[in-house]
């Protein structure tokens, strides 16, 4: 990238923002005020929700967003057109499907309209941030006597992009039994007595085919096997398919 | 990239460089400056993005300016108020299109604060 | 700002061995996170973004990785050639900030 050098001619650019020495100490001060950090979730593919924390700013102040993606052709940005407001004050921005676009670096800047020079921008991979929805109609049924398998539906189109992680414990047991299931949607657990009641949640994530998303879905409504025969609860609670 | 500057600058007094580049347009990719005090590290100052908008290295925001003219493919970096610790090699770096961080360098131009 | 801390500001390994250089954020940076090398009296050069992309023609034996705050460049079969700065930078949120350097001497 070799280039003859030439010097500045006095014509530059004046959509970037002026300068003058004669600021005010006061301006200064507030615009080297540092803008709270953006956290953006996808949440099932389906939308976005980005939000900062506008307690934060030292005075009530509606921060504007915008956003863009960076790719070869062009990087336009542009201003969120659907605010969400705490006590009156922007704090976040609800974007639609048709705005997400997981595998392009997604740009968003975070800027106080009273004082152009403070701004933020950062980037962020929006297929590590894809929250999917609990898994949904989870099922237990008999493979043996003593082996039961799990199944659950995702809410998610395409299944091979999550893992998920399911726990299960008997009313014997104080903690959680885990363990992670890669790309399917069952699970099967050898050895279980007919004596004890277990509980069965699940939980999926983004992850690692299709993204690296860290952030877990809620936790499916519970399914129980079994029979709790102490004389407390003498109640039964069977799911069977 | 090609970065061209005074070289030698009175304390008090400011400091202007120019990134000259070629092979891409100013409207498609951002331009970062960094510089690098003799025998010390990488330090950011800030970029112009491809959009115009602008970010400076928060301690350096009430002396920084940096501005272009996308006609004639120039980067200006203004630094007001110099002192001896602004004595550095000061570069200007592409940001990639695909690339997110600084993909190509200047070879830098050398800035001594010094009466 | 976030402050990105490399604990080692000098390293030493011998041609053909691997070795190791670390860099921590202040805060989770979600993997934005670039390594440069800085050969003597060059300008700094790309080697690694979003913590694991190679950028192009840059050897494979050099390889990135981490997440949240802690990121590594793994530089394996080291090569002569490969004495040099090594620095780390997140690209996650402005103002951009680099870890302040370590120095590759080769034995």
């Known amino acids: 990238l070799n280039s003859t050098v030439l010097k500045p001619s006095g014509n530059e650019d004046t959509t970037a923002d002026s300068f003058s020495t004669s600021e005010t100490l006061e301006s200064l001060n507030i615009s080297t005020l540092p803008l709270p950090e953006v956290q953006c979730f996808v949440f099932n593919g389906e939308y976005m929700n980005c939000t900062w924390n506008s307690s934060s700013e030292p005075q009530p102040t509606n921060l504007t967003l915008q956003y863009g993606y960076k790719n070869s052709d062009n990087y336009k940005v542009q201003e969120c057109g659907h605010y969400k407001f705490s006590k009156e004050i922007t704090s976040g921005c609800w974007l639609p499907k048709s705005e997400i676009r997981l595998y392009e670096t997604f740009v968003v800047r975070l800027q106080d309209p009273r004082e152009p020079r403070r701004q933020m921008e950062q980037k962020l991979k929006l297929q590590n941030l894809v929250i999917p929805w609990a898994p949904e109609n989870l099922t237990l049924r008999n493979l043996s006597e003593s082996q039961l398998e799990l199944s659950w539906k995702n809410r998610y189109a395409l299944d091979h992009c999550l893992q998920h992680l399911v726990q299960y414990r008997s009313d014997w047991d104080s903690n959680w039994t885990e363990q992670q299931v890669d790309h399917k949607q069952s699970f099967s657990l050898p050895s279980v007595d007919g004596q004890k009641l277990y509980t069965f949640r699940v939980r999926s994530r983004f992850n690692p085919l299709c993204g690296s998303a860290q952030h877990w879905s809620k936790w499916s409504h519970p399914v129980y096997w079994g029979s709790n025969i102490s004389k407390e609860n003498p109640w039964l609670f069977i799911t069977k398919a | 990239l090609q970065e061209s500057g005074p070289g030698l600058v009175a304390p008090s007094q400011s400091l202007s460089i120019t990134c000259t580049v070629s092979?891409?347009?100013?409207?498609?990719?951002?331009v970062h400056w960094v510089r690098q005090p003799p025998g010390k590290g990488l330090e950011w100052l800030g970029v112009i993005w491809a959009g115009g908008s602008t970010n400076y290295n928060s301690a350096l925001m009430s002396r920084l300016n940096i501005n272009r003219d996308n006609s004639k493919s120039q980067i200006f970096l203004k630094m007001n108020s110099l002192q001896t610790d602004d004595t550095a090699i000061y570069y200007c770096a592409r940001e990639g299109s695909t690339v997110d961080s600084m993909d190509y360098w200047g070879q830098g131009t050398t800035v001594t604060v010094s009466s | 700002d976030i402050v990105m801390t490399q604990s080692h500001k000098f390293m030493s390994t011998s041609v053909g061995d691997s070795i190791t250089i670390t860099c921590k954020a202040s805060q989770d940076v979600t993997t934005a996170v670039a390594w440069y090398q800085q050969k003597p009296g060059q300008s700094p050069k790309l080697l690694i973004y979003w913590a694991s992309t190679r950028h192009t023609g840059v050897p494979d034996r050099f390889t990135g990785s981490g997440s949240g705050t802690d990121y590594t460049l793994t530089i394996s079969s080291v090569q002569a050639e490969d004495l040099a700065l090594y620095y780390c930078?997140?690209?996650?949120?402005?103002?951009?900030?680099f870890g302040g350097g370590t120095k590759l001497e080769i034995k």
């Open positions: 930078q997140q690209h996650y949120i402005t103002p951009w900030t």
């Open positions: 092979g891409f347009s100013l409207t498609s990719y951002g």
